[in-house]
Interface confidence: medium
């Protein structure tokens, strides 16, 4: 015997109080699959969250973060304050990267400049708070005709995590 609820499409629920009739989801709720016995409450985007996608009868709302914050975690489970390039977020707020470190993003932590001398290279462009050092050829390679330049190592993307 087929379950009558299996005929209820997304956006409805199988209403046990009304002989298992398919009733539309009430306001501020949704069902993303058929055959549901209840509708789920829509996510609200409050505080430093803002609405990226409105809730519909078949899909939940989606939030992102207000300007000055960025999302953390799957589905933007929380928001974290942005800093400027050349800064990192500390317990005292946004602080400039210490000498010898850089951050080329608005989030994450300051990373050490590439140490060109470790690879036997010369420094082609000095590091700044916002950018890594660029290594040039090794002194031994600076003979006439040598012109290769090592591209800078990509900045590591710091891991972000939910609460």
């Amino acid at each position: 015997l087929q379950d009558p609820c299996s005929n209820c499409p997304a956006g409805t629920f199988c209403d046990n109080n009304r002989n298992q009739i398919c009733s539309p989801c009430p306001p501020n709720s949704f069902s993303s699959a058929g055959g549901q016995r209840t509708c789920d409450i829509c996510r609200q985007c409050k505080g430093v969250f803002r609405t990226r996608k409105e809730c519909s009868s078949t899909s939940n709302a989606e939030c992102d973060c207000t300007p000055g914050f960025h999302c953390l975690g799957a589905g933007c489970s929380m928001c974290e304050q942005d800093c400027k390039q050349g800064q990192e977020l500390t317990k005292q707020g946004c602080k400039d990267c210490r000498f010898g470190t850089f951050n080329d993003q608005k989030r994450g932590i300051c990373q050490p400049w590439t140490n060109c001398s470790l690879d036997g290279k010369s420094v082609l462009v000095n590091g700044t708070k916002e950018s890594d050092a660029v290594c040039g050829p090794s002194p031994a390679d600076l003979s006439p005709g040598a012109s290769s330049v090592t591209p800078p190592a990509p900045a590591r993307e710091p891991g972000h995590s939910p609460q």
Epitope: Q44, F49, C65, I109, Q163
Partner: antibody, heavy 118, light 107 residues
Framework: QVQLVESGGGLVQPGGSLRLSCAAS????????MHWVRQAPGKGLEWVSV????????YYADSVKGRFTISRDNSKNTLYLQMNSLRAEDTAVYYC???????????WGQGTLVTVSS | DIELTQPPSVSVAPGQTARISCSGD??????VSWYQQKPGQAPVLVIY???ERPSGIPERFSGSNSGNTATLTISGTQAEDEADYYC??????????FGGGTKLTVL
């Protein structure tokens, strides 16, 4: 299942130091912000500190700023709270917690008692 | 940070409805959670995101939040509901704030 187990509490004199630990299991520890919350005897809950999953970002309540340091060792699935310059008013049960955020559950340890007294 | 104010105590007869308030400046623009704490135990989340119940929490617990007041409502209060209740506000970012707590007595 998620488990949080605090340790390191005890009796300490005013001005002294203590380090609390919280051993976590049952979830990917490094994916989550972790909190310390305390409760003085017969009083309410007070949020103390939080640390990001990577350990790079930390935040503190004004009442402990400059005296307490939160840290974590993701290789050991352990959260820490280093408490220095302790005062009588720091006497409390200290809970380690993974507090609710959107899509994420809420879990607390059983707490460890810190008593600051001479 | 927002300051959350709760009544120190609320009394209710068994089977009646208990309402515990949590007031704070424009608290309706933030998320409110409610915790139940029994003596010697860690707090237990009973309401999150203003009005949602975690699995395992009885349907008699409900929440609302608008303007400057959030409310925890316990319908058909039972003796086992006697406990301390704390509200907590969260704006989606990092830190948290707790209310002072309310002792619920079931007469």
């Amino acid at each position: 299942q998620v488990q949080l187990v605090e340790s390191g509490g005890g009796l300490v004199q005013p001005g002294g130091s203590l380090r609390l630990s919280c051993a976590a299991s049952g979830f990917t520890f490094s994916d989550y912000y972790m909190h310390w919350v305390r409760q003085a005897p017969g009083k309410g809950l007070e949020w103390v500190s939080v640390i990001s999953g990577s350990g790079s970002n930390t935040y503190y309540a004004d009442s402990v700023k400059g005296r307490f340091t939160i840290s974590r060792d993701n290789s050991k699935n352990t959260l820490y709270l280093q408490m220095n310059s302790l005062r009588a008013e720091d006497t409390a049960v200290y809970y380690c917690a993974r507090l609710y955020a959107q899509f994420e559950g809420d879990f607390w340890g059983q707490g460890t008692l810190v008593t600051v007294s001479s | 940070d927002i300051e959350l104010t709760q009544p120190p105590s609320v009394s209710v007869a068994p089977g009646q409805t208990a309402r515990i308030s949590c007031s704070g400046d424009n608290i309706g623009s933030k998320y409110v959670s409610w915790y139940q704490q029994k003596p010697g135990q860690a707090p237990v989340l009973v309401i999150y995101s203003d009005s949602e119940r975690p699995s395992g929490i009885p349907e008699r617990f409900s929440g609302s939040n608008s303007g400057n007041t959030a409310t925890l409502t316990i319908s058909g209060t039972q003796a086992e509901d006697e406990a301390d209740y704390y509200c907590q506000s969260w704006d989606g970012s990092i830190s948290r704030v707790f209310g002072g707590g309310t002792k619920l007595t079931v007469l």
